[in-house]
């Protein structure tokens, strides 16, 4: 068998809402993956599990099942959405995200994704993780790759 390549492309959009009573931020983050099947037979993308971390705390998880079948030597782009909540001990972020003196409220999130593929009864898992900028102050649609946070050695806390 040849490889199945998974490439995390980046954040496609982030839609924000607030609960003023709870001082809580809700971010629906849609991410894009490219999955390439380098084999001469079809493979099934069985599931995608994703989680988002802010400051080493998991703020959102998602799982998609029975997603698609990728034909031989084919590539498919898959979008998946992770609902995230910044609350409780991180409610200090509500101050930052709702401060109107700032126009771009970028926070650094760690996106983790695991893709499970199957072919001929064999299962394979491929994982990726990437730091991304997301604006927690307004709804944003990104050009693919625009939200990448390059300084992975020093993520903002």
């Amino acid at each position: 068998p040849r490889s199945i390549d998974v490439k995390y492309i980046g954040v496609k959009s982030a839609y924000v809402s607030y609960d003023v009573q709870k001082r809580t931020i809700y971010l629906n983050i849609t991410n894009t993956l490219n999955i390439t099947n380098n084999n001469y037979y079809s493979v099934e993308v069985e599931n995608i599990t994703a989680q988002v971390q802010f400051s080493k705390t998991v703020i959102g998880k998602a799982r998609l099942n029975n997603i698609t079948i990728i034909g031989p030597l084919d590539m498919k782009q898959i979008d998946y959405t992770v609902p995230t909540v910044i609350a409780e001990e991180m409610s200090y972020m509500y101050d930052f995200c709702t401060l109107i003196s700032i126009k771009v409220h970028n926070i650094v999130l760690m996106m983790q994704v695991t893709v499970t593929t199957t072919y001929f009864g064999h299962s394979e898992q491929i994982s990726q993780e990437r730091y991304q900028y997301v604006d927690c102050g307004r709804n944003t649609t990104y050009q693919l790759g625009q939200s990448e946070y390059l300084n992975v050695l020093q993520p903002q806390q």
């Epitope: 003023v20 009573q21 200090y92 709702t98 401060l99 102050g137």
Partner: antibody, heavy 119, light 111 residues
Framework: EVQLVESGGDLVKPGGSLRLSCAAS????????MSWIRQTPDKRLEWVAT????????VYPDSVKGRFTMSRDNVKNTLYLQMSSLKSEDTALYYC????????????WGLGTSVTVSA | DIVMTQAAFSNPVTLGTSASISCRSS???????????LFWYLQKPGQSPQLLIY???NLASGVPDRFSSSGSGTDFTLRISRVEAEDVGVYYC????????FGGGTKLEIK
């Protein structure tokens, strides 16, 4: 109904101090940033200070930086503006206003409290 | 600081006709995020300022649709399609691209 009621305005001498208050009601005070704006005798509006919803961040223009301090008490639903080293040019009607994080505007204003700095 | 410039008085208008009020900023208020941080406030006699327009062209809650606003990055116009007696007051443009600054205000005059 959103209500903002300022108080504490007075006649003070140059170099003196004064603390203004703004009592908020009709909305979840702890969920919104707040601002102070003043209107000079010639009717010009000048932004004075902004504080974030939890009081973590404050922002001031150079004209009042180091002399004015904005704070808030989210239990009492009250906003404060501590003014010191007052000058004659600080004479104005002082308004408090709510910052709206969707419109990025100051969407509700109080009726104001008058501060006069004069010898 | 960004300077906002307005004429002190509008051209006198007749009730029921349209009025335009202009404002100019010393720097473009269009942010790279696509939002123009230009606002209009109306101060009626004896009252505090009230929000009319946010982000250049959006009508604030409760504001009649007789009001509209348009502009480029630096030149802006507030239009009132059918002026009513209750529209009398001073109209301020403001920006918060870089902290808040206000124009000097334009007094709407009725013939």
């Amino acid at each position: 109904e959103v209500q903002l009621v300022e108080s504490g305005g007075d006649l003070v001498k140059p170099g003196g101090s004064l603390r203004l208050s703004c009592a908020a009601s009709g909305f979840t005070f702890s969920g919104y940033g707040m601002s102070w704006i003043r209107q000079t005798p010639d009717k010009r509006l000048e932004w004075v200070a902004t504080i974030s919803s939890g009081g973590r961040y404050t922002v001031y223009p150079d004209s009042v930086k180091g002399r004015f301090t904005m704070s808030r008490d989210n239990v009492k639903n009250t906003l404060y503006l501590q003014m010191s080293s007052l000058k004659s040019e600080d004479t104005a009607l002082y308004y408090c206003a709510r910052d709206n994080f969707y419109s990025y505007a100051m969407d509700y204003w109080g009726l104001g409290t008058s501060v006069t700095v004069s010898a | 600081d960004i300077v906002m410039t307005q004429a002190a008085f509008s051209n006198p208008v007749t009730l029921g006709t349209s009025a335009s009020i202009s404002c100019r900023s010393s720097k473009s208020l269009l942010h790279s995020n696509g939002i123009t941080y230009l606002f209009w406030y109306l101060q009626k006699p004896g009252q505090s300022p009230q929000l009319l327009i946010y982000q250049m062209s959006n009508l604030a809650s409760g504001v009649p649709d007789r009001f509209s606003s348009s502009g480029s990055g630096t030149d802006f116009t507030l239009r009132i399609s059918r002026v009513e007696a209750e529209d009398v007051g001073v109209y301020y443009c403001a920006q918060n691209l870089e902290l808040w600054t206000f124009g000097g205000g334009t007094k709407l005059e009725i013939k």
